[in-house]
């Protein structure tokens, strides 16, 4: 069964800046990746970025840079300032859509530790 992993890290240099990394563990080819915060995209979450392997990347503030790392993983950097900036307990979710298999999603947040780290 395919799985999705999510890692959230707070940048040491900019403590209000976040990096979200997500990956798809499965054999299907990815058609679309949606990154949201505040919960899954279908349950009240707000879309931060949509990445399509052919048609490009769309992103919305406070997303600063979304990119493909590999054919099955992506990363997203969030701006750390402004009213819409994330806080330490914000949940980030990634949804990978693969045709014709379907969609898989997972969520993660910053680890409880005050140090920058990872959350699977």
């Amino acid at each position: 069964t395919p799985e999705v992993w999510v890692q959230v890290r707070m940048e040491a240099t900019e403590l209000s800046s976040f990096t979200i990394r997500c990956g798809f563990l499965g054999s299907g080819s990815i058609s679309l990746v949606t990154v949201s915060w505040g919960g899954p995209n279908g349950a009240g979450g707000t879309t931060l970025a949509v990445l399509h392997p052919e048609r490009g990347i769309r992103q919305w503030a406070p997303a600063r840079q979304a990119r493909w790392e590999t054919q099955s993983s992506i990363s997203l950097i969030l701006e750390g300032s402004g009213a819409s900036s994330p806080c330490a307990n914000t949940t980030f979710c990634c949804k990978f859509a693969s045709f014709p298999e379907g969609s898989w999603e997972a969520c993660g947040s910053l680890p409880p530790s005050s140090d920058p780290g990872l959350s699977a």
Epitope: P40, N41, G42, A43, R55, P100
Partner: antibody, heavy 120, light 107 residues
Framework: EVQLVESGGGLVKPGGSLRLSCAAS????????MSWVRQAPGKGLELVSA????????YYLDTVKGRFTISRDIAKNSLYLQMNSLRAEDTAVYYC?????????????WGQGTLVTVSS | DIVMTQSPDSLAVSLGERATINCKAS??????VAWYQQKPGQPPKLLIY???HRFTGVPDRFSGSGSGTDFTLTISSLQAEDVAVYFC?????????FGQGTKLEIK
């Protein structure tokens, strides 16, 4: 304007074969996933087969596996469904449909359909 | 397989009145739910995708809502041209599945 035009339907005896075609125009055919959906007389909709834009990943309804083959010819902007060992229960209108990644794989455009009747 | 169950099977509503069609999934389908309208002798037409987004050219009297397993298509003020069969559809997990359809008529 997006257009999908099916052909190839007709009356065939049980055990016979048909090849359905769907001529696509008005969009970049190679960039979209495509499907065949059927509707038996007075009944609901059933996804029969689907093919990824990469032409590698495919889906078949359990009851047609081993009998039907989906394919496409990018040069001719055409989708095909080769139907072998036809049964009475395959009688239906067969629709060609396009899937839109950005719409959660919803089928945003459909052809008018072609009627397949399997009867002795 | 994910089973999509629509209710009611048929519905009669007066012109100008509200029509509501429900769709229940046998398991969570995230937001990957679409609604289609099919008139006699015609192919289905996409009305709503991602639960609540109207497709190009669809009148704003059509709206979709819901999450998880329960979804609703609402026509705020029924028009004569809305007489049709309506299908919900999930594209969250293969195999994609449809509801059995709801026949909407004028009372």
């Amino acid at each position: 304007e997006v257009q999908l035009v099916e052909s190839g339907g007709g009356l065939v005896k049980p055990g016979g074969s048909l090849r359905l075609s769907c001529a696509a125009s008005g969009f970049t055919f190679s960039s979209y996933h495509m499907s065949w959906v059927r509707q038996a007389p007075g009944k609901g909709l059933e996804l029969v087969s689907a093919i990824n834009s990469n032409d590698i990943n495919t889906y078949y309804l359990d009851t047609v596996k081993g009998r039907f083959t989906i394919s496409r010819d990018i040069a001719k902007n055409s989708l095909y469904l080769q139907m072998n060992s036809l049964r009475a229960e395959d009688t239906a209108v067969y629709y060609c449909a396009r899937h839109e990644d950005y719409y959660g794989f919803a089928m945003d455009y459909w052809g008018q359909g072609t009627l397949v009747t399997v009867s002795s | 397989d994910i089973v999509m169950t629509q209710s009611p099977d048929s519905l009669a509503v007066s012109l100008g009145e509200r029509a509501t069609i429900n769709c229940k999934a046998s398991q969570s389908v995230s937001n990957d739910v679409a609604w289609y309208q099919q008139k006699p002798g015609q192919p289905p037409k996409l009305l709503i995708y991602y639960v609540s987004h109207r497709f190009t050219g669809v009148p704003d009297r059509f709206s979709g809502s819901g999450s998880g397993t329960d979804f609703t298509l609402t026509i705020s003020s029924l028009q004569a041209e809305d007489v049709a069969v309506y299908f919900c559809h999930q594209a969250y997990r293969s195999p994609w599945t449809f509801g059995q359809g709801t026949k909407l008529e004028i009372k």
